[in-house]
Interface confidence: medium
Amino acid sequence: MEIPMSTVVKETLTQLSAHRALLTSNETMRLPVPTHKNHQLCIGEIFQGLDILKNQTVRGGTVEMLFQNLSLIKKYIDRQKEKCGEERRRTRQFLDYLQEFLGVMSTEWAMEG
Amino acid sequence: MEIPMSTVVKETLTQLSAHRALLTSNETMRLPVPTHKNHQLCIGEIFQGLDILKNQTVRGGTVEMLFQNLSLIKKYIDRQKEKCGEERRRTRQFLDYLQEFLGVMSTEWAMEG
């Protein structure tokens, strides 16, 4: 049975806390850190940073599970991205989606001027 | 003085409601409508759909303001995307950002299995 993605994400958050000391052992490394809180726009950079981190981290043990979970999350996001243009529907349904997107932007995004 | 983006978004939502009848006058048109609610992953498709809609809509009058505002929103999002990889920081700061992203994913994303 496939584990729900929400469970994978929660588990990953726990593992991230547990492995912080190991992951931050290389203090010379520099990774891309976005300068705003709209994380959803920066998924490419987040996973690019994770690839760098993965290649610089001593592997083995339970940290493997963390990277496996992060890989599952990336696959999930890629699948979701594929679904963006999967269906072509009527204008009114497109407008519903646009309206929802702008509603989310209006309430949940961190916006400056 | 630059209008805050939050104001532009709210104004666009109002304009969208006001112009719905005009925008849906071509019932044969088909536009990309994502099959999930993680709008943030589908920004490319949303604006691609808007370009199609713009080219098919009778122009002039107050609907111009709607398309101008949508263009401002696109520019804002593009600027935000540029800021994703602008800075390189230490691992712990990258991990903070990753943690925030996963936290948002865990609480705000619509996730299936």
Epitope: Q93, D96, Q99 | S17, T24
Partner: antibody
Framework: QVQLVQSGAEVKKPGASVKVSCKAS????????INWVRQAPGQGLEWIGY????????RYNQKFKGRATLTVDKSTSTAYMELSSLRSEDTAVYYC????????????WGQGTLVTVSS | DIQMTQSPSSLSASVGDRVTITCKAS??????LSWIQQKPGKAPKTLIH???RLIDGVPSRFSGSGSGQDFTLTISSLQPEDFATYYC?????????FGQGTKVEIK
Amino acid sequence: QVQLVQSGAEVKKPGASVKVSCKASGYTFTNHHINWVRQAPGQGLEWIGYINPYNDYSRYNQKFKGRATLTVDKSTSTAYMELSSLRSEDTAVYYCARDYGNFWYFDVWGQGTLVTVSS
Amino acid sequence: DIQMTQSPSSLSASVGDRVTITCKASQDINSYLSWIQQKPGKAPKTLIHRADRLIDGVPSRFSGSGSGQDFTLTISSLQPEDFATYYCLQYDDFPYTFGQGTKVEIK
């Protein structure tokens, strides 16, 4: 407040036509589609079609195509539904309903107009 | 045309009961479904749209769920004013089609 007020009851002979009106008030008439729905006595609801008052574009249920005609008069904010070649099975209450601007559900309904077709 | 099959066609319940009505579409309608209440001799009234969104002013005892083909309307605690006929309506594709209705009667 937003209201749709329909014309009064009609009695028609088979083969005749009927024109039901639906006067809108309390909102910008051209911003919302007007749908027409009917309900035969003791039966369920049936969608006839809608009209977009902005450009007079109308869409019909195939079942009524050719017999139903949807029109609007923007100057009086009134929508009309005309049904021709009436038969006894067209006896029903006819409702107009406004499409809400965001998300397309019917948010306001007229009070209904009873059309009786009888010889 | 998309067929909407509602069940049950009628039910008897008491004040305070939890009532569930289901609606099945003959094909995927996404979440383009609304629930409509009609009392005898009155115009219909929309309660829920987009499958689960309660319309302003509608009591919170009404709730909707589902997507795709299977949908449910739930009244958590039936009140005297809830005795009526309930219809589902799909507005995903033309022609819009209604379920045949569920009459909720007093036991």
